[in-house]
Interface confidence: low
């Protein structure tokens, strides 16, 4: 996260870590007892790694009584994800078992109406992806507010020029914006989950490259089938 | 404006079945669980269970889980409850619910139906 | 399943007075609490959510708080159209489960 602020801890118990071989991949979020939602191209390099997922986590090395490791049963990308495109980034991961709930674990609603955010909304994007150009990577979740961007303004030729579907969203990114390791990460608007941080080489904090969300409620009847 | 117009009262015989009406207007029917509650003056509110209007998925709760089936026609925006094997014990107003703002089932019944009574009696 | 406990079936209250009704979840529910207003002859309403959310259109007179396995609806200065039936709802885990009710009377 670029020019955003430590989080209050465990405020965001939906927050989700994946991890590769025990460090911190992507973000994630908790959608039902036994689900993280993703990003799909998360998994492209993870190959033959063990791949896990950390719930109920501020700090990703101190320990924390809530904090605890879930093995995945089953890492479900988007059938229509590829390794080229920013369409359909999406991935969810079953847990070994159902979470155990409590004040710092907890799904998060997500939106199904399948209805653009009104641009200049403020969204929450969380994560522990880098804070500066150096990649710098925090031990601690940080999140910044963004303002949704209206679709027209994110397609222009300087900016993301035609790309951005109605199946994706975009929100400002002048010096305040998401960044690599933040991938798979939330976008919470009003208290629903509305987008997911897509994953990709996307320049940070540049205000002609909008941050680009994949919209959920565009997603709903794939999650449903996976969650079902 | 979102509104739940439930089927009318039922008078039905002990060990007969009984199928309630819900449809929907005002908002995109798919797009929200359909809940169904139950309500007599002994066991005051009891959820029956959900049904996920776009993929006809459902989650029980298991009190109910044996005798009730919840269905929906999408070309209609109608979802549908039946309960079989009824008792005396069945009597009761059965209201349809829809979620708020998410199909998630996590925030509360924002919208009701306005109750249909059954009565089960002799 | 989770028990939800109203322990008063009845409360009176006069017009302008502030009234507490209270809900005991047999298990920590982390907040996932809702209430409900149900006046005679009426369908249940939406009031709060997530402990303290109020639903469109609550008048901010109605309050919620609470953790753990403690929550409270509160009426800051209580109005006759208030005179209802007030229902807990934990959202926490299905099957969802309600309160038995507190019905609030006014003097």
């Known amino acids: 996260i670029l020019g955003g602020r430590e989080a209050e801890a465990h405020a965001r118990p939906y927050m989700a870590s994946v991890q590769l071989n025990g460090a911190h991949l992507c973000g994630g979020v908790l959608v039902a007892e036994q689900w993280v939602l993703s990003a799909a191209h998360c998994l492209e390099d993870a190959a033959d790694g063990k791949v896990q997922v950390l719930l109920g986590a501020h700090s990703l090395s101190q320990p924390e009584p809530s904090k605890r490791l879930y093995d995945v049963l089953r890492a479900v990308p988007h059938p229509d994800s590829q390794p080229d495109t920013i369409d359909h980034d999406l991935l969810l991961l079953q847990l070994s078992e159902k979470a155990t709930l409590g004040p710092a674990v907890r799904p998060l609603p997500w939106q199904r109406v399948d209805r653009d955010v009104a641009p200049g909304t403020l969204c929450d994007v969380a994560g522990w992806g880098i804070v500066n150009h150096a990649g710098r990577r925090p031990d601690s979740l940080q999140h910044v507010l963004l303002p949704v961007l209206d679709r027209a303004t994110c397609n222009r030729r300087t900016h993301h020029d035609g790309a951005i579907t109605e199946r994706l969203m975009c929100a400002e990114s002048n010096r305040r914006d998401s960044c690599k390791g933040d991938s798979g990460g939330p976008l919470v608007c009003g208290g629903v989950l509305e987008g997911v941080v897509t994953s990709g080489s996307r320049v940070c904090g540049n205000r002609k490259k909008p941050g680009i969300y994949t919209r959920v409620a565009s997603y709903a009847a794939w999650i449903d089938s996976v969650l079902a | 404006e979102v509104q739940l117009q439930q089927s009318g009262p039922e008078l039905v015989k002990p060990g007969a079945s009984v199928k309630i009406s819900c449809k929907a207007s005002?908002?995109?029917?798919?797009?929200?669980?359909m809940n169904w509650v139950k309500h007599s003056p002994e066991k005051s509110l009891e959820w029956i269970g959900d049904?996920?209007?776009?993929?006809?998925?459902?989650t029980y709760n298991q009190k109910f889980k044996a005798r009730a089936t919840l269905t929906v026609d999408k070309s209609s925006s109608t979802a549908y409850m039946q309960l079989k094997s009824l008792t005396s014990e069945d009597s009761a107003v059965y209201y349809c619910a829809t979620t708020y703002y998410s199909g998630n089932s996590y925030v509360g019944f924002a919208y009701w139906g306005q109750g249909t009574l059954v009565t089960v009696s002799a | 399943d989770i028990v939800m406990t109203q322990s008063h079936k009845f409360m009176s209250t006069s017009v302008g007075d502030r009234v507490s009704i209270t809900c005991k979840a047999s298990?920590?529910?982390?907040?996932?609490v809702a209430w409900y207003q149900q006046k005679p002859g009426q369908s249940p309403k939406l009031l709060i959510f997530w402990t303290s959310t109020r639903h469109t259109g609550v008048p901010d007179r109605f309050t919620g708080s609470g953790s753990g396995t403690d929550y409270t609806l509160t009426i800051s200065s209580v109005q006759a159209e208030d005179l209802a039936l007030y229902y807990c709802q934990q959202h926490y885990t299905t099957p969802w489960t309600f309160g038995g009710g507190t019905k609030l009377e006014i003097k």
């Open positions: 005002g908002y995109s029917f798919t797009a929200y669980y």
């Open positions: 298990q920590d529910v982390s907040t996932a």
């Open positions: 049904i996920n209007p776009s993929t006809g998925g459902t």
